[in-house]
């Protein structure tokens, strides 16, 4: 069963509000930039359900169970035509290169998920990096909108390279390090 | 007086290396793209005073300082005629606008040192950055030629953008160092 | 030595507000997040958000959003943890804590020694 | 969020090694490798042990390691030290609007 939730009958937030629980998800659509899901709520019937902002939510399990059937569904529905979704629509006159059309052909082919720069969004700025994953990777915040993802810094280097720049300059401190600074991996100083 | 800093006598760095003190920096020079310090030893004789590779050093202070002398030395230069390098008249592919030959035709008529993109070089690698001047500066490398200059971080940000991207992700060391070397904020060892 | 110094315990009554402090020294305050995490008596730890000073550009816990106010005045190297209006609920411990890398994504490797608020009629 | 799961106590004799495990799901742990672990003793702020899945701060003892499989993530502590005995947590990314998970923690008592 799903985890208690918010529900945001109206976008007030009072002190008070009461909690229910999602009994399941039902649908995704992305509105401005922001993914929604269609929740059915437990205890009340279909006619109450609600299509909720992902960052109100506290269901991830359910969230991730909804996102493997979508996947497949989806998958299933390549081969059909389809009314391009508003979110596919969308144009933006962020970067609109070759490769761009290229990769939104092959996602309009294959219904996947946008992710990253796929999304169309224009990044804002990086709020984070990692190379836990074995490529180094930057956390995108996108303008309008408070959702951020995972992208390849390859690719951010190449897309916007202005605010990788920009990331790097408010981040980067340039102290020397101790000589017993450990590993030493990256050496040559690098201070 | 300056920092501790390992004397590289050879460049195989044992284990139990002694630890030597900076008195000050008399001179500098890029020797295959990799700037250098003349060092005077604390409590040794001038005659051995020895040329260190700028990543091994930990006395920013003293660099800092003799910087200083060393470009009002070099603005003294200014005015004297003198042989164009090879440097300069070698062409460049990599930029040719208009912009460009405009401030080579005012550079031609006021005799003046080209100094940074101004030389007309293709940029190879940043090998070290400073903002002991206020703004950031790059210490840049260009293609084709062992000397190096300094370049402002805002304009090379723009020129080439790739080249600044590379030099900051060297620089990001993925372990964590111990906490005396923080402080330091944007210190100006800057690599 | 990076410190982070939080402001003192507190004691308050239900529905009165309440702002307390986490002063930030030995590094450059604005290239790090600042998160807030709070742990209630005998009980885990639980995040609550993060702010970064350079703008002021915060993430919430949905658990919290709504609840608490973030925010940071960098001129003074200062975040802020703030309630409008407080609950018996919202007695904890409540921790500062500073990035170990200015690009650290979700981990803290700095702490504050932590602010006690008791909320008590 | 939902916290992640972890065991409510473990124990072990000093010299011996013992693991903890943290246990999320595909929006958390499976998705990224992003998972922190803690060691808090009474009275105590916490202190960072392990980041980004096996990474270790300087000062930490290569006693401790981390690691993890599919949705789970876990610490392991060697040759177990009295001055081990703490509460561990284990802390994940979980995406924008979550951000960050805690788990519940885990009480770590050295024996005799």
């Known amino acids: 069963m799903g985890k208690k939730t918010k529900r945001t009958a109206d976008s007030s937030s009072s002190e008070d509000e009461e909690e229910y629980v999602v009994e399941k998800v039902l649908d995704r659509r992305v509105v401005k930039g922001q993914v929604e899901y269609l929740l059915k709520w437990k205890g009340f019937s279909e006619e109450h359900n609600t299509w909720e902002p992902e960052k109100n939510l506290d269901c991830p399990e359910l969230i991730s169970e909804f996102m493997k059937k979508y996947k497949k569904m989806k998958e299933g529905e390549n081969n059909k035509p389809r009314e391009k979704s508003e979110s596919n629509k969308r144009k933006s006159n962020f970067s609109n290169s070759a490769d761009d059309i290229k990769s939104k052909k092959k996602r309009e082919q294959s219904n996947d998920i946008a992710r990253g720069f796929e999304r169309g969004l224009e990044p804002e700025k990086i709020i984070g990096a990692t190379d836990s994953c074995g490529d180094l990777m930057f956390l995108m915040k996108w303008k309008d909108t408070d959702e951020a993802d995972l992208v390849l810094a390859k690719e951010a280097n190449v897309k916007c390279p202005q605010i990788v720049i920009a990331f790097y300059e408010e981040r980067l401190t340039w102290h020397a390090y101790p000589e017993d600074a450990e590993n030493k991996e990256k050496e040559t100083a690098k201070s | 007086m300056g920092k501790k800093t390992k004397r590289t006598a050879d460049s195989s760095s044992s284990e139990d290396e002694e630890e030597y003190v900076v008195e000050k920096v008399l001179d500098r020079r890029v020797v295959k793209g990799q700037v250098e310090y003349l060092l005077k030893w604390k409590g040794f004789s001038e005659e051995h005073n020895t040329w260190e590779p700028e990543k091994n050093l930990d006395c920013p202070e003293l660099i800092s300082e003799f910087m200083k002398k060393y470009k009002k030395m070099k603005e003294g230069e200014n005015n004297k005629p003198r042989e164009k390098s090879e440097s300069n008249k070698r062409k460049s592919n990599f930029s040719n606008s208009a912009d460009d030959i405009k401030s080579k035709k005012k550079r031609e008529q006021s005799n003046d040192i080209a100094r940074g993109f101004e030389r007309g070089l293709e940029p190879e690698k940043i090998i070290g950055a400073t903002d002991s001047c206020g703004d950031l500066m790059f210490l840049m490398k260009w293609k084709d030629t062992d000397e190096a200059d300094l370049v402002l971080a805002k304009e090379a940000n723009v020129k080439c953008p790739q080249i600044v991207i590379a030099f900051y992700e060297e620089r990001l060391t993925w372990h964590a160092y111990p906490e005396d070397a923080e402080n330091k904020e944007k210190e100006t060892a800057k690599s | 030595a990076v410190q982070l110094v939080q402001s003192g315990a507190e004691v308050k009554k239900p529905g009165e507000s309440l702002r307390i402090s986490c002063k930030g020294s030995?590094?450059?305050?604005?290239?790090?997040?600042i998160s807030w995490v709070r742990q209630m008596p005998g009980k885990g730890l639980e995040w609550m958000g993060r702010i970064d000073p350079s703008d002021s550009y915060t993430n919430y816990s949905p658990s919290f959003q709504g609840h608490v106010t973030i925010s940071a005045d960098k001129s003074i190297s200062t975040a802020y943890l703030q309630w409008s209006s407080l609950k018996t609920s919202d007695t904890a411990m409540y921790y500062c804590?500073?990035?170990?890398?200015?690009?650290?994504?979700?981990?803290?490797?700095?702490w504050g020694q932590g602010t006690l608020v008791t909320v008590s009629s | 969020a939902s916290a992640l799961t972890q065991p409510a106590s473990v124990s072990g004799s000093p010299g011996q090694s013992i693991t903890i495990s943290c246990t999320g799901t595909?929006?958390?742990?499976?998705?990224?490798?992003?998972v922190s672990w803690y060691q808090q003793h009474p009275g105590k702020a916490p202190k960072l042990m392990i980041y980004e899945g096996s990474k270790r701060p300087s000062g930490v003892s290569n006693r401790f390691s981390g690691s993890k499989s599919g949705n789970t993530a876990s610490l392991t502590i060697s040759g177990l030290q009295a001055e081990d005995e703490a509460d561990y947590y284990c802390c994940s990314y979980a995406g924008s609007s979550t951000f960050a998970v805690f788990g519940g923690g885990t009480k770590l008592t050295v024996l005799g």
């Open positions: 804590a500073r990035p170990l890398q200015t690009y650290s994504i979700a981990s803290v490797g700095h």
């Open positions: 595909s929006s958390d742990v499976g998705s990224y490798n992003l």
């Open positions: 030995g590094y450059s305050f604005t290239s790090y997040w």
